[in-house]
Interface confidence: low
């Protein structure tokens, strides 16, 4: 009796079970009663990453420099090319089809987490006692200068955007 289901890595065709092509190879012809499934390796710019019965391999992803992309990992016959973003850019989406510049943290905010190729800069407000006077994609909030340790006094209070201003102590005559 002809099979109604096949084992793993097989497929049912013309009432018989044929072997699937292994990753990196495409189907040329189905098996017959007398011959095995015929498969051919994908060409250099193509891949198939599963056991399959595809008659065409998939084209490797193109890491388009116009989109700020570069190759992170070159594709093989069994894997797709992995793109990442150029320095200073990160992916717009999980599939990394294009890149955008890292956000800078505005004055009053510091970098909590520096951007990576796949995630943007995470900024945080500078808490009391800290400041940032620059727009930067890598600078953390800096602590106010400690006037006391320099034997000076605070002449102007600090803010989240400015450091304290220290000055000499008024000497008693």
């Amino acid at each position: 009796e002809p099979p109604t289901a096949c084992r793993e890595k097989q497929y049912l065709i013309n009432s018989q079970c044929c072997s699937l092509c292994q990753p990196g190879q495409k189907l040329v012809s189905d098996c017959t009663e007398f011959t095995e499934t015929e498969c051919l390796p994908c060409s250099e710019s193509e891949f198939l990453d599963t056991w399959n019965r595809e008659t065409r391999c998939h084209q490797h992803k193109y890491c388009d420099p116009n989109l700020g992309l570069r190759v992170q990992q070159k594709g093989t016959s069994e894997t797709d090319t992995i793109c990442t973003c150029e320095e200073g850019l990160h992916c717009m989406s999980e599939s990394c089809e294009s890149c955008v510049p890292h956000r800078s943290c505005l004055p009053g905010f510091g970098v909590k987490q520096i951007a990576t190729g796949v995630s943007d800069t995470i900024c945080e407000p500078c808490p009391v006692g800290f400041f940032s006077n620059v727009s930067s994609a890598f600078e953390k909030c800096r602590p106010w200068t400690s006037c006391e340790t320099k034997d000076l006094v605070v002449q102007q209070a600090g803010t989240n955007k400015t450091d304290v201003v220290c000055g000499p102590q008024d000497r008693q005559r």
Epitope: D64, N66, L67, G68, L89, M92, E97, S98, C99, V100, P101, R103, L106
Partner: antibody, heavy 120, light 107 residues
Framework: EVQLQQSGPDLVKPGASMKISCKAS????????VNWVKQSHGKSLEWIGL????????TYNQKFKGKATLTIDKSSTTAYMELLSLTSEDSAVYYC?????????????WGQGTSVTVSS | DIVLNQSQKFMSTSVGDRVSITCKAS??????VAWYQQKPGQSPKALIY???DRRTGIPDRFTGSGSGTDFTLTIDNVQSEDLADYFC?????????FGAGTKLELK
């Protein structure tokens, strides 16, 4: 600099649909996004949505979902917006506006606009 | 949706004056604001992006400033060719939204 050439003005009947084209003077659209913007007579600008020519991915303003459909033909570097089931409310000038990937929403380059009049 | 309020629909000015056009966002949009100039019968033209960066070819009498919710476009030494409508745009969040516009006219 990218030039965007839009199709000419159109007079259409209520209930009809129409398609506006936006042809870019670039060898390759890759690396640009194309936004579409509506300007009703004497009024401000409304963002309809954008399409990424690289993969045909679209993002719509919820208000225009079902009203506008954005498509792209990479081979001719032309973007299209189809407007469906037109009413008098859709009479306006429609612009395509493009920007480079490094700031995909800033709309650096604008087409000349396509005037659409919906009237029986 | 984020609303951009350009409270002055019209602003009167004279050639040589300095004028400031304001745009207030209903929530924090950081510096994701652009400014456009539109003359009658023409397409909008990009002037400023990311709140304060001037587009290539835009005269330096146009200056953008602000962050968070309050933004200003300042035109120093106004010229007759600057008489136009000015719109702000936020691109911090979808949907992108424009202000209602400020018309700059002669006194």
């Amino acid at each position: 600099e990218v030039q965007l050439q839009q199709s000419g003005p159109d007079l259409v009947k209520p209930g009809a649909s129409m398609k506006i084209s936006c042809k870019a003077s670039v060898y390759s659209f890759t690396g640009y996004t194309v936004n579409w913007v509506k300007q009703s007579h004497g009024k401000s600008l409304e963002w309809i949505g954008l399409i990424n020519p690289y993969n045909g991915g679209t993002t719509y303003n919820q208000k225009f979902k079902g009203k506008a459909t954005l498509t792209i033909d990479k081979s001719s570097t032309t973007a299209y917006m189809e407007l469906l089931s037109l009413t008098s409310e859709d009479s306006a000038v429609y612009y395509c506006a493009s920007s480079y990937y490094s700031n995909p929403y800033a709309m650096d380059y604008w087409g000349q606009g396509t005037s659409v009049t919906v009237s029986s | 949706d984020i609303v951009l309020n350009q409270s002055q629909k019209f602003m009167s000015t004279s050639v040589g004056d300095r004028v400031s056009i304001t745009c207030k966002a209903s929530q924090n949009v950081h510096t994701a604001v652009a400014w456009y100039q539109q003359k009658p019968g023409q397409s909008p033209k990009a002037l400023i992006y990311l709140a304060s960066d001037r587009r290539t070819g835009i005269p330096d009498r146009f200056t953008g400033s602000g962050s968070g919710t309050d933004f200003t476009l300042t035109i120093d030494n106004v010229q007759s060719e600057d008489l136009a409508d000015y719109f702000c745009l936020q691109h911090w969040n979808y949907p992108l939204t424009f202000g209602a516009g400020t018309k700059l006219e002669l006194k």
